[in-house]
């Protein structure tokens, strides 16, 4: 095509995550999937400079073709702010990422205690939920119901019947997963909610309940100020 | 019925290499943390290596760092251990472990299945 | 590292008899989730580990009720209630809390 156009991100979502904290010995991959006409070159900065092959034993690779920066084995060394900067003559773009990388011992994701807190709000409410979740290994979090079938709450194998309501995937950034937000609640929605956190070492999870109240009268709607639920 | 069926053991002379690889069944391995752990002869475990389920990180042993890879292939629910300068101290069972799941879980949350192990012997 | 140790080294126990076995680890396994992750096995001679008790407490499926463990933070027990012939056999601690994962040295545990 004859369209001349400046350097533009092709996917964001992939760019979303800017800290990584990484084991050491695990392999680091970067991406900025970018686009352009002329197609752009892409060059890697670290820490502000040319990041150079002889700046880090092993060197790394960049494959040009995927946008990607590929460090394998990495060490306390490599810690830093790596910048992807692609540019062709209509314009320049970049992206940083902070790495950081974890040597002391890997743990069971630790949950904050208190969190998520017990919740009550009338039919027709909102409620949200908060976990906040540490863990040196990067965790995948779940937002669980437990839920109800034929009036049983359990299956017949014992074990408690659940609906994962929401799961970090591609397009989840670490802090959209962390709050579960409930728009206008039913009763249907009472009961207990679970935040899951994994990682490769293990799982740790805590439960709150959100108890749903039946809703004011009408005449109570119209006078009560905005936040007469606190 | 769910199992681990570990392979790849044998002699091999010190500084030599060896790849391990355990094959999964009877649960969905794309799921599960895999670990390996060894056992010396007439000695107690070590653990080894863990690997995360989708094999984006790794954890080793200080014992075993910087020589041995764990890796894993989630299409053939495969699990492996590439083991490089092998040294006489490294002659033991090494046992394939399942780790922890992605989900909720009643039970315990890994540590519960364990293969039958296969023999490394490093010896001149 | 956590260390796991483990003591007795060896325990012979009449047939019928309690068996104890005791687990310290050189910090708590106490977990912000309010769990303990000591783990217990069992191992026979030319057999893998088996899972006897995970979370401090918790019998696995299809252990023998005889089988219980027990404390907190940084002490656990492990107790047979009424050791039988088919108990014979090496028993370890683990912590699974952080890696490395450790394991305590081992109990055998003979028939007097």
């Known amino acids: 095509s004859n369209n001349k156009r400046a350097p533009y991100w092709t996917n964001t979502e992939k760019m979303e995550k800017r800290l990584h904290a990484v084991p050491a010995a695990n392999t680091v991959k970067f991406r900025c999937p970018a686009g352009g006409n002329p197609m752009p070159t892409m060059r890697w900065l670290k820490n502000g400079k040319e990041f150079k092959q002889e700046h880090r034993i092993g060197g790394y690779k960049v494959r040009n073709q995927h946008w990607s920066l590929i460090m394998e084995s990495v060490v306390p060394s490599d810690k830093g702010n790596y910048t992807c900067v692609v540019e062709n003559e209509y314009g320049s773009i970049n992206h940083t990422y902070h790495l950081d990388v974890v040597e002391r011992s890997p743990h069971r994701p630790i949950l904050q205690a208190g969190l998520p807190a017990n919740a009550s709000t009338v039919v027709g409410g909102d409620v949200e939920f908060v976990c906040k979740v540490y863990s040196d290994a990067q965790p995948h979090i779940q937002w669980i119901k437990h839920v109800e079938k034929n009036g049983s709450k359990y299956g017949p194998d014992g074990l408690p019947y659940l609906k994962v309501l929401k799961a970090a995937g591609v397009n989840t950034t670490d802090k959209e997963i962390e709050v579960l937000y409930i728009r206008n609640v039913t009763f249907e929605d009472a009961g207990e909610y679970t935040c899951l956190a994994g990682n490769s070492i293990g799982i740790s999870f805590h439960s709150a309940w959100l108890t749903v109240l039946p809703a004011p009268g009408r005449e109570k709607e119209i006078t009560a100020s905005p936040d007469y639920l606190e | 019925e769910v199992q681990l069926l570990e392979s790849g053991g044998g002699v091999v002379q010190p500084g030599r290499s060896l790849r391990l690889s355990c094959a999964a069944s009877?649960?969905?391995?794309?799921?599960?943390?895999m670990h390996w752990v060894r056992q010396a002869p007439g000695k107690g475990l070590e653990w080894v290596a863990v690997?995360?389920?989708?094999?984006?990180?790794?954890y080793y042993a200080d014992s075993v760092k910087g020589r041995f890879t764990i890796s894993r292939d989630n299409s053939k629910n495969t699990l492996s251990l590439q083991m490089n300068s092998l040294r006489v101290e490294d002659t033991a069972i090494y046992y394939c472990?399942?780790?922890?799941?992605?989900?909720?879980?009643?039970?315990?949350?890994?540590?519960?299945?364990w293969g039958q192990g296969t023999m490394v012997t490093v010896s001149s | 590292d956590i260390v796991m140790t483990q003591s007795p080294d060896s325990l012979a126990v009449s047939l019928g008899e309690r068996a104890t076995i005791s687990c310290t680890s050189s910090?708590?396994?106490?977990?912000?989730?309010?769990?303990?992750?000591v783990y217990w096995y069992q191992q026979k001679p030319g057999q893998p580990p088996k899972l006897l008790i995970y979370?401090?407490?918790n019998r696995f499926s299809g252990v023998p009720d005889r089988f219980s463990g027990s404390g907190s933070r940084t002490d656990f027990t492990l107790t047979i209630s009424s050791l039988q012939a088919e108990d014979v056999a090496v028993y370890y601690c683990?912590?699974?809390?952080?890696?490395?994962?450790?394991f305590g040295g081992g109990t055998k545990v003979e028939i007097k």
């Open positions: 910090r708590s396994l106490l977990h912000s989730d309010g769990k303990t992750y």
């Open positions: 690997i995360s389920y989708d094999g984006s990180n790794k």
């Open positions: 472990v399942r780790g922890a799941g992605r989900g909720y879980t009643y039970g315990p949350d890994g540590f519960d299945i």
């Open positions: 009877g649960f969905t391995f794309s799921s599960y943390a």
């Open positions: 979370e401090l407490s």
């Open positions: 683990m912590q699974y809390i952080e890696a490395p994962l450790t």
